[in-house]
């Protein structure tokens, strides 16, 4: 969590952001609230990047001026308008690139003052895995999949009754590059399965971790998966 | 390679409505901006609006506002164009089109274009 | 909304002539950040879809005949062929993005 404070020689506001994560080609959010003021019409919202010359994004007078707009940004921005007189100033970033990572400015104008804070925005991709049995494998074998990471990821398998065991042996993992040439499919396969027992497939960048759980018995096959990015601070 | 390829000519009565259909290939639909031109016979070119199909946004010049209506299918990578409360003077040929991608904006340049769609308003 | 205004109408250019068509915006298209003018230039012929040949002003798309260029800056601009050829007989469209998009009303290249 960034909190900023206004500039000297006018009354400060509080500006609040978090950092963030975006997965690529999906739309993301930059987050940001600030002190509301009562008249939409006083309130100026500006984003910017560090190392961009024109802005992210500009709100002002109660609608978008995106005169000034890198032209990076053209098309992919939107504060959600309703919601800027309560205090949000947060940025919806569409199609979401690698290149969109880094240090933001989240400035703000009312009529109470001035203030910013910045929010460190890391972008890569990031999925859900999917952990199945391979009946076609010789043994029991269990496939974890995961279609799209970048950067590339670790993978991890562990087991509820065998805690703490290594499976780096008796596991394969491969990373098949995906048609748009940045992220990759994440494939692990895992051998040498007993029965009645839970297996976690655990895939991990600097942006996110997700965990693929499997439960094998006798009479059937439970799933669950989840996933957590890893670097949400407020600021 | 991109491609987007439209639907046949129509012939339509004043009054009616009108939905050109523009099927796109050879990238991801749902991140690109569709802009729809028309041109009317021997005229200019003229922006109508645009559709982005990933959320459904859309932005349209005041002069066809309350008149035509942009959507799009993502299962069918389709993007639509419907013109209601047709008049003679509505009779052109419809363009999609789509912007070259740049740092992944596309609201930008016209680099690819459907082989356009007459529309013919006559009673 | 932005009304682009472009002259001559029509123009007659003989063969490895210079031909010279002039594009004026109602408001200028600079980006006073990033110093880019938000304009670009299409070509169209007969029975075909435009097809774009400069962008923010100056910027030739990939593929297009170094004898296209763009100048201008603000609210004025020009499209110059250095060299008429045959294959650019063609109506010329300039258009506008800094708010939304404009086209301008064409101008039509023929040979003399």
């Known amino acids: 969590l960034i909190i900023g404070f206004g500039i000297s020689g006018r009354h400060s506001i509080t500006v609040t952001t978090v950092a963030s994560a975006g997965n690529i080609g999906e739309d993301g959010i930059l987050s940001c609230t600030f002190e509301p003021d009562i008249k939409l019409s006083d309130i100026v919202i500006q984003w910017l990047k560090e190392g961009v010359l024109g802005l992210v994004h500009e709100f002002k007078e109660g609608k978008d001026e995106l005169s000034e707009q890198d032209e990076m940004f053209r098309g992919r921005t939107a504060v959600f308008a309703d919601q800027v007189i309560v205090g949000n100033a947060s940025l919806r970033l569409k199609n979401v690139q690698l290149t969109d990572a880094g240090t933001y400015k989240c400035y703000i104008i009312t009529s109470k003052g001035k203030g910013n804070a910045n929010l460190e925005y890391k972008t890569g991709a990031f999925s859900m895995p999917e952990v199945n049995v391979d009946y076609n494998a010789s043994s029991e074998t269990l496939r974890c999949e995961a279609p799209r990471w970048f950067p590339q990821p670790t993978v991890v398998w562990a087991s509820q009754v065998d805690q703490g065991a290594n499976f780096s042996e008796v596991s394969n993992t491969s990373f098949e590059l995906n048609s748009e040439n940045v992220t990759m499919k994440v494939v692990s396969v895992l051998y040498n399965v007993t029965i009645n027992n839970t297996y976690s497939c655990m895939i991990e960048n600097d942006i996110a971790k997700a965990t693929g759980d499997i439960k094998v018995t006798e009479s059937e096959i439970k799933r669950r998966s989840h996933l957590q990015l890893l670097n949400s601070k407020a600021s | 390679e991109v491609q987007l390829v439209q639907s046949g000519a129509e012939v339509k009565k004043p009054g009616s409505s009108v939905k050109v259909s523009c099927k796109a290939s050879?990238?991801?639909?749902?991140?690109?901006?569709m802009q729809w031109v028309r041109q009317a016979p021997g005229q200019g070119l003229e922006w109508m609006g645009a559709?982005?199909?990933?959320?459904?946004?859309?932005r349209y010049t005041q002069k066809f506002k309350g008149r035509v209506t942009l959507t799009a299918d993502k299962s069918t990578s389709t993007a639509y164009m419907e013109l209601s409360s047709l008049r003679s003077e509505d009779t052109a040929v419809y363009y999609c089109?789509?912007?070259?991608?740049?740092?992944?904006?596309?609201?930008?340049?016209?680099?690819?274009w459907g082989q356009g769609t007459l529309v013919t308003v006559s009673s | 909304d932005i009304v682009m205004t472009q002259s001559p109408d029509s123009l007659a250019v003989s063969l490895g002539e210079r031909a010279t068509i002039n594009c004026k915006s109602s408001?200028?298209?600079?980006?006073?950040?990033?110093?880019?003018?938000?304009l670009a230039w299409y070509q169209q012929k007969p029975g075909q879809p435009p097809k774009v040949l400069i962008y923010w002003a100056s910027s030739r798309e990939s593929g297009v005949p170094d004898r296209f260029s763009g100048s201008g800056s603000g609210t004025d601009f020009t499209l110059t062929i250095s060299s008429l050829q045959a294959e650019d007989v063609a109506v010329y469209y300039c258009k506008q993005s800094y708010n939304l998009y404009t086209f301008g009303g064409g101008t039509k290249v023929e040979i003399k």
């Open positions: 050879g990238y991801t639909f749902t991140t690109y901006w």
């Open positions: 559709i982005y199909p990933g959320d459904g946004d859309t």
């Open positions: 408001q200028s298209l600079l980006n006073s950040r990033t110093r880019k003018s938000y």
């Open positions: 089109a789509r912007g070259r991608d740049y740092s992944g904006s596309s609201w930008t340049w016209f680099a690819y």
